[in-house]
């Protein structure tokens, strides 16, 4: 908390310039009025100012506006935006999209902040839904704010939006969220070459179905094990070995390390056991040779 | 087929800045990441940055925030980085390239000398 | 950020001789997005291996590229003259996408 003291004579500020660089924070207290301050808060990003003296103009900020600050000001805080905490953002109303990218502009490059976090949650309650335009705008900042969405609030994601997203973007999505995006992605690398599309599509193909996997089998891809164990089980329990000797390629030799695991476990129990003996990997649990197989899923449908 | 064609070598004075471009044809220039890289005489490749012109999402190499502007005009399916308040360190070879899962295709460079 | 470091920094080999040259991330990339280009003096870079293993089109055979986590490698089973030229590792895994420093293939 900064003392009240009287501006000394001649030091008051007319305008927000650089010449309040050199004032110390106990005049800049004194002498910035805090309602100049909130009109000409397009100036301040502009000139370099301290932390201490940015702490110094949030408080008069504060002290203007108790209640939360007005969106015409909230546009123009550029890095003071860094200054603020959640509980001041909880109480701001934002509606214009202008002012969010305003602010994720300043936060850019960086880790989606809890600042930043409680922005979108305010922003996006105050418009009611989440529309194509902020979808677009938060999927280029934070392509990772994908997976922080439910499958419904997915299913409005444009596949345009998709060639933004990295993989490191979708360590947190979980399967019903990829069986949302992947044929999304689909759709958005569907001109791109073989090699290119299996790369752009591994990180999504934890929502792809067994069809694509059988397709993806007959094209030299080499899958690599982690990519193998993100599949869903479902989809990967009807492929035979030689489908995924022919998707893993060289990288077959990694099931063995797998063997307990998931689907790799489940997929090797539907497997007969001298299917699994060509591999040579010595992967055991397979259904012993002479052994029928029903489907016991097959029988309840007919009866 | 794919073709990246860069502008022409450019001379400029300290504290200038300079505005290349990078001219797309031979796919939908939209769907792929336009990525920028600085090789200077006898050094390695260093990223910049890159821009998606199909939303205008870009990002930028922390090192040339505030250095590097990227923009695009789909119009005429051109990539452009503006370089601000030159300096001899950013004397250099400029490449621009397309990025599906790699840099698939590259410019031929544009040299940008800065010299008093 | 992902450093990766190369080494050697510049090598000379004898015609026919086999080459090795490495590529080492500060952390894990990924297979799939570890890349190596060539570059030969007053050209740009060619996108030479893609996903560590996979030749890029028009790449003679002799060329192969192997490894995993944090450690790559390009070798070439019998160097030739045209395989002279710089060559440069990249990941494209995690944002800011990083190159290594060269590794500068000179013939002895």
């Known amino acids: 908390e900064v003392e009240k003291t009287a501006c000394p004579s001649g030091k008051k500020a007319r305008e927000i310039d650089e010449s309040l660089i050199f004032y110390k924070k106990w005049e800049l207290e004194a002498c910035v009025d805090a309602a100049l301050l909130a009109t000409q808060m397009d100036r301040v990003n502009a000139i370099p100012f301290t932390y201490e003296q940015l702490d110094v103009l949030k408080h008069k900020l504060d002290e203007l506006y108790p209640q939360g600050y007005p969106e015409s000001v909230i546009q123009h805080l550029g890095y003071l935006f860094l200054k603020m905490s959640p509980e001041d953002i909880r109480k701001w109303n934002v509606t214009s999209l202008e002012t969010l990218k305003a602010l994720l502009e300043v936060n850019k490059g960086h880790e989606m902040s809890p600042q930043v976090a409680t922005l979108i949650d305010r922003f996006v309650k105050g418009r009611g839904q989440l529309d194509k335009d902020t979808l677009d705008t938060l999927t280029a900042f934070y392509p990772g704010y994908l997976c922080s969405l439910s499958p419904e609030e997915l299913s409005s994601v444009p596949p345009s939006s998709i060639w933004a997203v990295r993989p490191q973007d979708l360590d947190t999505c979980d399967p019903r969220q990829l069986d949302v995006l992947y044929p999304k992605a689909r759709l958005a690398f569907q001109n791109m070459n073989g090699s290119e599309y299996f790369v752009k599509i591994q990180s999504f193909l934890g929502g792809a179905p067994t069809e694509d996997l059988k397709a993806l089998s007959q094209q030299n891809v080499s899958m690599d094990l982690a990519t193998f164990m993100k599949l869903r089980t479902d989809a990967v329990l009807p492929l035979t070995v030689a489908e995924v000797q022919k998707l893993l390629g060289p990288h077959v030799e990694g099931l063995k390390a797998e063997e307990r695991h998931r689907p790799v476990r489940d997929w090797i129990l539907r497997q007969r056991q001298d299917d699994l003996d060509t591999l040579g990997l010595g992967l055991q649990g397979g259904i012993p040779n002479g052994y029928l197989v029903l489907d016991l899923s097959m029988q309840e449908a007919l009866s | 087929q794919v073709q990246l064609q860069q502008s022409g070598a450019e001379l400029m004075k300290p504290g200038a800045s300079v505005k290349l471009s990078c001219k797309a044809t031979?796919?939908?220039?939209?769907?792929?990441?336009i990525e920028w890289v600085k090789q200077r005489p006898g050094h390695g490749l260093e990223w910049i940055g890159e821009?998606?012109?199909?939303?205008?999402?870009?990002n930028y190499n922390e090192k040339f925030k505030g250095k590097a502007t990227f923009t695009a005009d789909t119009s005429s399916n051109t990539a452009y980085m503006q370089l601000s308040s030159l300096t001899t360190e950013d004397s250099a070879i400029y490449y621009c390239a397309r990025a599906g899962a790699w840099f698939a295709y590259w410019g031929q460079g544009t040299l940008v000398t800065v010299s008093a | 950020q992902i450093v990766l470091t190369q080494s050697p920094a510049i090598m000379s080999a004898s015609l026919g001789e086999r080459v090795t040259m490495t590529c080492t991330a500060s952390s894990s990339v990924s297979s799939s997005y570890l890349h190596w280009y060539q570059q030969k003096p007053g050209s740009s870079p060619k996108l030479w291996t893609y996903s560590t293993s996979n030749l890029a089109s028009g790449v003679p055979a002799r060329f192969s590229g192997s490894g995993s986590g944090t450690s790559y490698s390009l070798t070439i089973s019998s160097m030739e003259a045209e395989d002279a030229a710089t060559y440069y590792c990249h990941q494209y895994h995690r944002s800011p996408w990083t190159f290594g420093g060269g590794t500068k293939l000179e013939i002895k």
């Open positions: 031979g796919y939908t220039f939209t769907g792929y990441w």
């Open positions: 821009i998606l012109p199909g939303s205008g999402s870009t």
